[in-house]
């Protein structure tokens, strides 16, 4: 708490200007009117205040707006935003995408801070859903944003927003998240033709079920190995050798290098060795010829 002291003669601030950088903390407290500061917040960013001086300015705004700052002030906070705590931000009602962008810009180049996470949470909750423009903005600043959301939070993403998602935005998503996003992507891209559809859906295929992979295998898509390795193991296991060959096209030869890794390893264990031999890749570990394969899960379902 800065002590209340009288403003020295001639130092009362009539506007927010560069002269204030030479004010001591107590002078800022005594000589700057909070209402003046609030109306001229847009000037603060261009003035090289120290963090200690910014602390004083924040304190003045906190006194003026104990229930939380109005959006007219929030959108001009600039570097003062870095001084806000998540508790401060929870009092805000941010509705404008421009305000969100302005504050994200301040944090650009840094990891997502608790302040930014709280701001985004407040903004998205206020909007009711993660619309395309918001998602566009958030993934532009934080490519990993989408994958930081829980499957429950992702369920509020409308299919139309999926158009804003870039492949790199999904890099850190786990299968549970892709399970939620894939059906939305399928719906969003449903009117595209084969090759265009595959380009768009490819990043989301980690959430695709077996029947969709079977359908893709009929479309000469030539899936690359990196995408194949990200598919759900349970979705890959039922695929036949012929279907995998069609799905991968010329990339099928890459299976050899991945034969010890999931899902390729598990898939090999489920295939007949003579079917694997037809690929001519030297894949080993399939079911030896003459062995009978019992699907125990089917047997349990019948009993």
């Amino acid at each position: 708490e800065v002590e209340k002291t009288a403003c020295p003669s001639g130092k009362k601030a009539r506007e927010i200007d560069e002269s204030l950088i030479f004010y001591k903390k107590w002078e800022l407290e005594a000589c700057v009117d909070a209402a003046l500061l609030a109306t001229q917040m847009d000037r603060v960013n261009a003035i090289p205040f120290t963090y200690e001086q910014l602390d004083v300015l924040k304190h003045k705004l906190d006194e003026l707006y104990p229930q939380g700052y109005p959006e007219s002030v929030i959108q001009h906070l600039g570097y003062l935003f870095l001084k806000m705590s998540p508790e401060d931000i929870r009092k805000w009602n941010v509705t404008s995408l421009e305000t969100l962008k302005a504050l994200l810009e301040v944090n650009k180049g840094h990891e997502m801070s608790p302040q930014v996470a709280t701001l985004i949470d407040r903004f998205v909750k206020g909007r009711g859903q993660l619309d395309k423009d918001t998602l566009d903005t958030l993934t532009a600043f934080y490519p990993g944003y989408l994958c930081s959301l829980s499957p429950e939070e992702l369920s509020s993403v409308p299919p139309s927003s999926i158009w804003a998602v870039r492949p790199q935005d999904l890099d850190t998503c786990d299968p549970r998240q892709l399970d939620v996003l894939y059906p939305k992507a399928r719906l969003a891209f449903q009117n595209m033709n084969g090759s265009e559809y595959f380009v768009k859906i490819q990043s989301f295929l980690g959430g695709a079920p077996t029947e969709d992979l079977k359908a893709l295998s009929q479309q000469n898509v030539s899936m690359d190995l990196a995408t194949f390795m990200k598919l759900r193991t349970d979705a890959v296991l039922p695929l036949t050798v012929a279907e995998v060959q069609k799905l991968l096209g010329p990339h099928v030869e890459g299976l050899k290098a991945e034969e010890r890794h999931r899902p390729v390893r598990d898939w090999i264990l489920r295939q007949r060795q003579d079917d694997l031999d037809t690929l001519g890749l030297g894949l080993q570990g399939g079911i030896p010829n003459g062995y009978l394969v019992l699907d125990l899960s089917m047997q349990e379902a019948l009993s």
């Epitope: 506007e15 950088i21 030479f22 003035i47 090289p48 570097y79 301040v106 650009k108």
Partner: antibody, heavy 115, light 111 residues
């Protein structure tokens, strides 16, 4: 339209002083920070010091402390920079600039120190 | 004394993008967002191109953009044009000395 107009070129003897002026027009003068920056031939920019006219007190780069005096006259919206004990290495173009971000610059004043 | 470090020269062909770096310390570039970039053509006064790390003054082309990571600020010029050939200086407000510090300048050549 903001303009900073500086005084003309000067030729000075070593050991003497030079005073360069910078007249501002087209904007408030008193509450802005005015800097002086110099540039020796073929060299980079070097900040010398600055002043907020309404306060009158200036601050200086350590290198020039004691040799440079920056003043301002609010009535004529003019900032001044005086450099004393001149030596040949002070030969440079001297600029005034407005604000800490230096959004407007004067045209520059060439000061030549030569015996 | 040069407080900020810039490459002495960079070059690029018309239409290309180039980036000029400016490295300082946590008390100038790193600690605060008060980094500016200036363009200077031979025989002319410097011109402000970027202030507060990434803001463009009105009248400056959007081909010029600024950013910062840690103690290093960067100026990127996209779609290089012949008139971009000039010297570029970064500057930062240093709170320790309450003054401005500059980089040594970077000569940009458009091939």
């Amino acid at each position: 339209q903001v303009q900073l107009v500086q005084s003309g070129a000067e030729v000075k003897k070593p050991g003497s002083s030079v005073k360069v002026s910078c007249k501002a027009s087209g904007g408030t003068f008193s509450s802005y920070y005015f800097s002086w920056v110099r540039q020796a031939p073929g060299q980079g920019l070097e900040w010398m010091g600055g002043i907020i006219p309404k306060f009158g007190s200036a601050n200086y780069a350590q290198k020039f402390q004691g040799r440079v005096t920056i003043t301002a006259d609010e009535s004529t919206s003019t900032a001044y920079m005086e450099l004393s004990s001149l030596r040949s290495e002070d030969t440079a173009v001297y600029y005034c600039a407005r604000r800490t971000s230096m959004d407007y610059w004067g045209q520059g004043t060439l000061v030549t120190v030569s015996s | 004394d040069i407080a900020l470090t810039q490459p002495a020269s960079v070059s690029g062909s018309p239409g290309q993008s180039i980036t000029i770096s400016c490295t300082g310390t946590s008390s100038d570039v790193g600690g605060y967002n008060y980094v500016s970039w200036y363009q200077q053509h031979p025989g002319k006064a410097p011109k402000l191109m970027i202030y507060s790390v990434s803001k463009r003054p009105s009248g400056v082309s959007n081909r010029f953009s600024g950013s910062k990571s840690g103690n290093t600020a960067s100026l990127t010029i996209s779609g290089l044009q012949a008139e971009d050939e000039a010297d570029y200086y970064c500057g930062a407000w240093a709170h320790m000395s309450l003054g401005k510090v500059f980089g040594g300048g970077t000569k940009l050549t458009v091939l």
